[in-house]
C-alpha cells in the first residue's frame, strides 16, 4: 500500500501475516514480530514499519520479540526467539521505556 505522508526512501519488505495484501510491502523499515499469546504457540509475522520505531529497541520477553531492519527484504530470513520462561515474580513487562 502506498504511504501518503512525505518521508525518506521507502524499503521493500517481506510480508507474512494474516493481514498482508501481498508477499511484500513498502515501508520506512522492515519488521519481524514474534508473539506468544496465552496458551498458544508463538507466531512470527513479517511486514513493514512506519510508526513507533521505539518498539524496535524493546528487549525480548517471554511473550514478544520485535526486530527491525532497513534494507531491501532484510526481514525475509530472520528467525526470532523469545526469552526463556521466568518465574511469575520475575516476569518482565512489555513496556519498552
Amino acid at each position: 500500500d502506498p504511504v501518503k505522508p512525505s518521508r525518506g526512501p521507502l524499503v521493500t519488505c517481506t510480508c507474512e501475516s494474516p493481514h498482508c495484501k501481498g508477499p511484500t510491502c513498502r515501508g520506512a523499515w522492515c519488521t519481524v514480530v514474534l508473539v506468544r499469546e496465552e496458551g498458544r504457540h508463538p507466531q512470527e509475522h513479517r511486514g513493514c514499519g512506519n510508526l513507533h520505531r521505539e518498539l524496535c529497541r524493546g528487549r525480548p520477553t517471554e511473550f514478544v520479540n520485535h526486530y527491525c531492519c532497513d534494507s531491501h527484504l532484510c526481514n525475509h530470513n530472520v528467525s526470532l526467539v523469545l526469552e526463556a520462561t521466568q518465574p511469575p515474580s520475575e516476569q518482565p513487562g512489555t513496556d519498552g521505556q
Partner: antibody, heavy 118, light 108 residues
Framework: QVQLQESGPGLVKPSQTLSLTCTVS??????????WNWIRQHPGKGLEWIGY???????YYNPSLKSRVTISVATSKNQFSLKLSSVTAADTAVYYC??????????WGQGTLVTVSS | EIVLTQSPGTLSLSPGERATLSCRAS???????LAWYQQKPGQAPRLLIY???SRATGIPDRFSGSGSGTDFTLTISRLEPEDFALYYC?????????FGQGTRLEIK
Amino acid sequence: QVQLQESGPGLVKPSQTLSLTCTVSGGSISSGDYYWNWIRQHPGKGLEWIGYIYYSGSTYYNPSLKSRVTISVATSKNQFSLKLSSVTAADTAVYYCAREATEGFDYWGQGTLVTVSS
Amino acid sequence: EIVLTQSPGTLSLSPGERATLSCRASQSVSTTYLAWYQQKPGQAPRLLIYGASSRATGIPDRFSGSGSGTDFTLTISRLEPEDFALYYCQHYGTSSITFGQGTRLEIK
C-alpha cells in the same frame, strides 16, 4: 466502518483502580498497521495522551502516568483495556480510546466520563 | 519530550474569513508525524490533517496544513459556521505522543 466503544464504570472511588475497555468493531486489532491508544480530557481542558498498545502486547506510556497505568490487549475479543491505579479527583476526565495509523488518530471512541468521588 | 505550543489561544473571526492557526514545537519534528484535529463540544476529536499537509478522508479542501521543522500552520480558507470549534495539533508515531493545548476558534 471501524468503530471504537469505551465501556466501564462512570464512578470510581478515590484510591481505587479505574478500569475501562475499548471494543473495536469493523476491523481487526491484530493488524500490524495500527496502534491502540488511550487519551483523556479533563473537564474544560485539553487532550492528554495516556499510552498505547500494539497487537503484540508491547506498550508505551506517558511518563507522567507510567507508574499508575497498565494497558492490555485481548486480540481474541478485539478489545484493549486501561487500568489506572490509586486514582484521585484529578483523574476525573473523559477517557477516549483511539486507533493510530500512519495517517494519525483516524478513529476515536465517543468518550466516557469517569468521575472520581467518594 | 516534545512540547507543542499553539497560538493564539482564542481566535475570533466571522464566517467567510480566513483562519490561520499556529503550532510550534520545542524541537524539530518530522512532518510525517504532525496532525491536526477539530473538536466540537461533547464530541470526540476528528482528524483533519496528517503528515503536516495531507487532508484526512472526507475533509473539505478549505482546510490545509503546512510547515516543517518547528513551525506548522493550519489554514481554513473560508470559514463556514460549522468550523467554529477547538483545534489541536499533535505529534504522533513516536514514544512520546503529545498534543498542543488547543486553539479555540469562535464567532466574532
